[in-house]
């Protein structure tokens, strides 16, 4: 039994961390395979974690973690049994993949404007909470080709766009994502996606 | 190995304060976050307070928001949770639990609220 | 705040059965859901984390599964020692809530 591909792990930077691997042919990952894992300081406690299957040869591991710090960094050791397969480290802090947003909701009784809000994911205290940023999809449901993002550079969780912008009389869907620049983190995955009817007064034209 | 050890319950009358300790042993408490987490008799688990190890930072249930404290003294291992103006339904088995996502309890202390 | 409706909040079983018991979040909380189970008496033990971790040192017959809103505990061949009182637990965000149990007894 030996890994194809080495684990790569991604941080929520609160409290979980997620490593996936392939091993070099089918694998019962929960029943076979063991990641320890143990934050790097004295008088830590190596904690177990059972992997579960991703795929035939993947497996997936969600590592709990106390409230992650900047300067904290793990060992893993993966195990087969009696056999060491694989050691490496993992740095939370140096491989974050946010939380989704959640509670998006569309407002669409601000005359003509459409007002989207969400909720940062984060509590206050967190480091990320100050400094995630947004990107937000609209598609329309009738028309594939009509699908925009709008980057939300600024930290409040909102944005505000002309319903004149979109069709009129037609049913449109939106999404949120976030990042942070200062970990250089990947993107979230989208949240839960909202649908609305979008409807507007459309101005009288002279001929 | 781990222990967590809570102290300080008792009977006390509506209106009065109480306050719980932790001691925590077996690991290096200043590195973990703590919760309180009560059940009162016969009924199911209330998550009450938790302390980062991070930040300090403090959140509360609403239902004891204001009347609450959470606190921790690293050098003595020890979580504390002081109690204001207590009411009827604070009645329960207080636990400290540690994170992430409450991995050790303590074996609870009794608080009893009555007149 | 995010509330945790589990059902049923009781139920009969006998030994061998195959037990599910489901949880709903009144809004999207991911996989950040756990499952405890407690004996009367006794301090609650974590089962299952990250909606389908199973905890280390846990028999293998729990397992869970769910995102989102909508997750389930599955006991799939009940023992003797596995009547308990179960209890769903949200920490996507705080407050952090539990539900309100469900109570597996012998039939």
């Known amino acids: 039994m030996k890994v194809l591909q080495e684990p790569t792990c991604v941080s929520d930077y609160m409290s979980i961390s997620t490593c996936e691997w392939k091993m070099n042919g089918p694998t019962n990952c929960s029943t076979e395979l063991r990641l320890l894992y143990q934050l790097v300081f004295l008088l830590s406690e190596a904690h177990t974690c059972i992997p579960e299957n991703n795929g035939g040869a993947g497996c997936v591991c969600h590592l709990l973690m106390d409230d992650v710090v900047s300067a904290d960094n793990y060992t893993l050791d993966l195990w087969a049994g009696q056999q060491l397969l694989w050691k490496g480290s993992f740095k939370p802090s140096e491989h974050v993949k946010p939380r989704a947003p959640g509670n998006l909701t569309v407002h669409t009784n601000v005359s003509d404007t459409l007002l989207l809000t969400w909720s940062n994911p984060y509590p206050p205290d967190n480091y990320l909470y100050n400094h995630l940023t947004y990107a937000v999809n609209i598609w329309s449901e009738n028309d594939p080709a009509d699908f925009r993002i709008y980057n939300v550079t600024y930290r409040e969780p909102s944005l505000r766009i002309a319903a004149s912008t979109l069709k009129s009389g037609i049913s449109y869907r939106a999404r949120v994502r976030a990042w942070a620049q200062c970990y250089n983190t990947t993107w979230s995955e989208w949240s839960p996606s909202t649908k609305w009817h979008n409807s507007y007064r459309e101005p009288f034209e002279q001929h | 190995q781990v222990q967590l050890v809570e102290s300080g319950g008792g009977l006390v009358q509506p209106g009065g304060s109480l306050r719980l300790s932790c001691v925590a042993s077996?690991?290096?408490?200043?590195?973990?976050?703590m919760n309180w987490v009560r059940q009162a008799p016969g009924k199911g688990l209330e998550w009450v307070s938790y302390?980062?190890?991070?930040?300090?930072?403090?959140y509360y249930a609403d239902s004891v928001k204001g009347r609450f404290t959470i606190s921790r003294d690293n050098a003595k291992n020890s979580l504390y949770l002081q109690m204001n103006s207590l009411r009827d339904e604070d009645t329960a088995v207080y636990y400290c639990?540690?994170?992430?996502?409450?991995?050790?309890w303590g074996q609870g202390t009794l608080v009893t609220v009555s007149s | 705040d995010i509330q945790m409706t589990q059902s049923p909040s009781a139920m009969s079983a006998s030994v061998g059965d195959r037990v599910t018991i489901t949880c709903r979040a009144s809004q999207d909380i991911s996989n950040y859901l756990a499952w405890f189970q407690q004996k009367p008496g006794k301090v609650p033990t974590r089962l299952i984390y990250a909606a389908s971790s199973l905890q280390s040192g846990v028999p293998s017959r729990f397992s869970g599964s769910g995102s989102g809103t909508e997750f389930t505990l599955t006991i799939s061949s009940l023992q003797p020692e596995d009547f308990a009182t179960y209890y769903c637990?949200?920490?996507?965000?705080?407050?952090?809530?539990f539900g309100q149990g469900t109570k597996v007894e012998i039939k």
């Open positions: 639990a540690r994170e992430p996502v409450f991995d050790y």
């Open positions: 302390i980062s190890r991070a930040t300090g930072a403090v």
């Open positions: 637990l949200q920490w996507s965000s705080y407050p952090r809530t």
């Open positions: 077996g690991f290096t408490f200043s590195h973990s976050s």
